[in-house]
Interface confidence: low
């Protein structure tokens, strides 16, 4: 007949499981419950996946692993009396008088409930890694944390190599015994202990549960250390950089922590498991019953089979590990779960030229000397596309790509961003907004939706802001509709006349050169270089200024670079930026200073692209540690990551304009990194590649 095989992880658990099986049988509960002995939760998950067992209750981190690695699904959740439905919240608490925010945690002193505990360690550390605030090299999370905070109390970290830093704030009991023990001997252990560590001024931030502050302040705590504490003297750190009252934990937390749940194989009927357990809890969850599902006292242990604090078991409607864990906890787990044993020893970087091979070789040597992990290996390819193919085929691991290549890498090869380049704020040539500039003209004002029949000025054929993005955007929005993939003809028919300088004018529609003026002698008209006065972004703006065109497609800085005295050439000397406006995608017009909100797209920074199964945090962790040593162009450590001048080339491995490698944060897909507008423009253009 049908039976459910529960997996027990210890002798006491096996004992309780046997009793539960007997009690269920006695009560006539079907199907039969059998017990299988595993050695650990991990082992049980393997037994379930191998169809040698059927069910086990797991905590959030184990549910993540079981779901991601073994395809198991949660079907029954625990509900706890004291908690918020099937979850509680992990929060970061600070003194109200301090100025700490989530963005300024580096260097502060931290208080944790215990090593590897959910709210005291896993969630905050995972969150800090996943959000890019904390970089981890070579899966050495302990080292990363010990370097990040300015001393901590992490009970249980005394056995680790980083106890000096991670136990620095711990104090043991009143006689100094048990310092940093993962037990009540350490006064700063557990939720109340971590909060005490903050309250007594040992630490600046405490990672605890949403209820911890309220349970230990305002006279609610018996021990003398908390008698005078007021909840209003503490605040929560929110993920957006703000702070909030300690009662605002629903809105201001690091993550919602899911309850423990029963997991089974994907082919197991979750309803059946719930019916079995529901029948059981109906009969065996109250005091005085012959068997108590939610008590482990009789076995001399805690939390056997289910947490003792469980008040009821409930069916899980959406039976996926992602839905049960929720995106906040899921993200934190992604940041935390890094297995050093499964970390590849090498990161194979894709290189495209002889100078790049030389620079990559030097980078590999420099990184190895500093014991950076994983080690770099250099693998050459013929083109960016060839790199993508080789990465997909697992022959290479990483490559830095530009916007259009990121699009192809993501869409065609399934690659994802692992780190990005960041350029100086004043550097507008590497990451910029594409804008449509018009004259401020109240009598003949038109909008982006009314461009048909207007005269247009473009930097040049194929230029990102002058051609690709604006034309792609107009195609995507349905204004320009090319026939038989003939974009040039479609654009020439859409605008009344244009200037789109080009290098190879064969079969080029004459109207795309109609507004061009050539050089001072009227020669070289429409050529794709500066001999054409309307060439480039400055030239396209000049085309608008001199009334040749009605709209110019340029970078967001073009107007500022050529007005208000910033360009002394005669055509620009007297221009005022306030005489120009931007056309916005929503049909409005805006001041030229509103480019961040009124643009056709943002040209994204370059990004390092990898396979989706690559741990992006180890890639960023490596680059972040490396840039501390080699990121400054004036460093004396023998290698310059963001400079190619020693190799007689430019933009090798990374763009030379890069000032830092940055984490991708929430932009974990190619679409997220590129932004919707830029993707839409590229899709508009790529829809015409027949």
């Amino acid at each position: 007949g049908m039976e459910v095989r529960w997996c027990a992880t210890s002798d006491p658990e096996q004992h309780k499981c046997g009793n539960m099986s007997e009690a269920f049988r006695e009560a006539g509960i079907q199907p039969s419950l059998l017990c299988v002995r595993g050695t650990s939760a991990d082992h049980c998950v393997q037994l379930i996946a191998a169809q040698e067992a059927d069910a086990i209750t797991l905590d959030g981190g184990a549910i993540y692993e079981a779901g991601k690695e073994h395809g198991l699904k949660p079907v029954v959740g625990e509900v706890y009396d004291q908690e918020v439905g099937t979850s509680y919240y992990a929060v970061a608490v600070v003194r109200r008088s301090s100025h700490v925010t989530i963005d300024t945690l580096k260097g502060v002193k931290s208080c944790h409930t215990g090593i590897n505990r959910t709210v005291g360690w896993n969630v905050p550390v995972g969150y800090l890694v996943e959000s890019g605030r904390l970089s981890v090299m070579g899966c050495d999370v302990l080292k990363a944390v010990s370097d990040y905070f300015g001393g901590s109390c992490v009970p249980g970290a005394g056995e680790t190599s980083y106890s000096e830093s991670l136990c620095r704030l711990c104090r043991g009991d009143s006689s100094g015994e048990g310092v940093c023990d993962k037990s009540p001997l350490e006064r700063y252990y557990d939720y109340s202990g971590a909060f005490r560590c903050l309250a007594e001024g040992a630490g600046d931030v405490a990672f605890v549960k949403h209820s911890t502050v309220l349970e230990n302040t305002d006279g609610k705590t018996l021990p003398s250390w908390g008698q005078a504490l007021l909840s209003q003297d503490f605040e929560l750190l929110c993920r957006d950089g703000s702070r909030a009252d300690v009662t605002e934990w629903r809105q201001c937390h690091l993550a919602r922590v899911p309850a423990h749940a029963v997991v089974v194989r994907a082919d197991t009927d979750g309803g059946l498991i719930f019916r079995l357990l529901n029948e059981g809890q109906r009969l065996f969850s109250h005091e005085g019953s012959s068997f108590q599902m939610f008590s482990s006292e009789a076995y001399g242990q805690k939390d056997l089979l289910f947490k003792d604090s469980t008040s009821e078991l409930v069916p899980i409607a959406t039976q996926t590990y992602e839905a049960w864990l929720g995106h906040e906890y899921l993200h934190a787990m992604k940041g935390l779960l890094c297995d050093p044993n499964r970390l590849p020893p090498y990161l194979r970087w894709c290189v495209l030229s002889t100078p790049e091979i030389q620079k990559c070789g030097d980078m590999a040597v420099a990184f190895r000397r500093q014991r950076l992990k994983p080690e770099i290996q250099c693998v050459s390819a013929k083109s960016p596309q060839h790199c993508m193919e080789r990465i997909q085929a697992e022959q290479v691991d990483a490559v830095t790509l530009s916007g259009e290549d990121i699009y192809t890498a993501g869409k065609t090869y399934g690659l994802v961003p692992a780190a990005g380049e960041h350029y100086a704020p004043e550097d507008s040539s590497n990451s910029y907004y594409v804008v449509a500039v018009v004259r401020r003209d109240s009598s003949h004002a038109f909008t982006l939706d009314e461009l048909r029949g207007k005269r247009s000025c473009h930097a040049g054929f194929g230029s990102p802001a002058g051609w690709d993005v604006p034309v792609g955007a107009l195609i995507q929005r349905g204004f320009i509709r090319p026939k038989d993939c003939d974009v040039l003809t479609a654009v020439s028919e859409f605008f009344n006349a244009s200037c789109v300088p080009v290098n190879n004018p064969k079969n080029y529609p004459s109207s795309l050169c109609a507004l061009c003026v050539g050089d001072e002698q009227g020669r070289n008209k429409c050529v794709g270089n500066s001999q054409e006065r309307y060439y480039g972004y400055r030239g396209a703006f000049r085309c608008l200024v001199e009334n040749a065109g009605d709209v110019a497609f340029v970078r967001h800085t073009t107007v500022f670079d050529n007005t208000n005295g910033h360009n002394s050439e005669p055509w620009a000397a007297e221009l005022r930026s306030e005489d120009y406006e931007l056309l916005c995608p929503n049909g409005a017009r805006a001041e030229v200073s509103q480019f961040a909100a009124c643009n056709l797209a943002q040209i994204p920074p370059h990004a390092v692209m990898v396979r989706p199964d690559t741990n992006i945090f180890t890639v960023y962790g490596l680059l972040d540690k490396a840039q501390d040593l080699f990121g400054d162009d004036h460093n004396k450590n023998g290698f310059k990551m963001f400079d190619s001048s020693n190799y007689h080339g430019q933009d090798l491995l990374f763009k030379d304009a890069t000032v830092r490698a940055v984490p991708v944060g929430e932009k974990t897909t190619y679409r997220g990194w590129l932004g919707l507008d830029y993707v839409a423009a590229l899709e508009g253009m790529s829809s015409q590649q027949c």
């Epitope: 009927d269 409930v314 959406t318």
Partner: antibody, heavy 119, light 112 residues
């Protein structure tokens, strides 16, 4: 024991707004789903919408443009507003609870309050 | 919306008899998670509706075991093994597999 009690005017003029209150005792409206259902003359029942423990609302698409469900957790009450009523909205209005424990069946109902729409 | 059709409209019975009420759904009520969210309610005269059976066959707490639910897919049945006077009233089936939840038209159980 969980108890729900509806209150509000029994007569509403056409085109005006119908406003009802459901007072809950024996359970907190910060857990579960808190619903409004109405029963028309002739026994036809219609589910109108709910407000969840986290304050999220879901409405029957047939009423979406006219209905609003809100709550006051400090009073343990939740409310129904139905705009632009017509004679077709004449019905007995019930509030009810749904929880995971009964797979979102409505395990506890209020007594119901009769509302007539007439000028 | 998902239409729930109840038969009969009225069911005259003698006390102690067995009563059977049918409920048919316009589409299958099996959720993608494998569960079937079909429930039964009783509204006695002058009272609020009471939950009898949830998810096809689960009796709600306090409901006598003479009430039983069965069925699958689109066809469901509520049975009362021995009708007592306190069982009289209007019985409704309801589904919450699909959104929005919908109800059957009701079956009036009355004494012959």
């Amino acid at each position: 024991e969980v108890q729900l009690q509806e209150s509000g005017p029994s007569l509403v003029k056409p085109s005006q707004t119908l406003s009802l209150t459901c007072s809950v005792t024996g359970d907190s409206i910060t857990s579960g789903y808190w619903n409004w259902i109405r029963k028309f003359p002739g026994n036809k029942l219609e589910w109108m919408g709910y407000i969840s423990d986290s304050g999220i609302t879901y409405y029957n698409p047939s009423l979406k443009s006219r209905i609003s469900i809100t709550r006051d957790t400090s009073k343990n009450q939740y409310y129904l507003q139905l705009n632009f009523v017509t004679a077709e909205d004449t019905a007995t209005y019930n509030c009810a609870r749904r929880t995971l424990a009964t797979y979102y069946a409505m395990d506890y109902w209020g007594q119901g309050t009769s509302v007539t729409v007439s000028s | 919306d998902f239409v729930m059709t109840q038969t009969p409209l009225s069911l005259p019975v003698s006390l102690g008899d067995q009563a059977s009420i049918s409920c048919r759904a316009s589409q299958s009520l099996v959720h993608s998670n494998g569960n079937t969210y079909l429930h039964w309610y009783l509204q006695k005269p002058g009272q609020s509706p009471k939950l009898l059976i949830y998810r096809v066959s689960n009796r709600f707490s306090g409901v006598p075991d003479r009430f039983s639910g069965s069925g699958s897919g689109t066809d469901f049945t509520l049975k009362i093994s021995r009708v007592e006077a306190e069982d009289l009233g209007v019985y409704f089936c309801s589904q919450s597999t699909h959104v929005p939840p919908t109800f059957g038209g009701g079956t009036k159980l009355e004494i012959k």
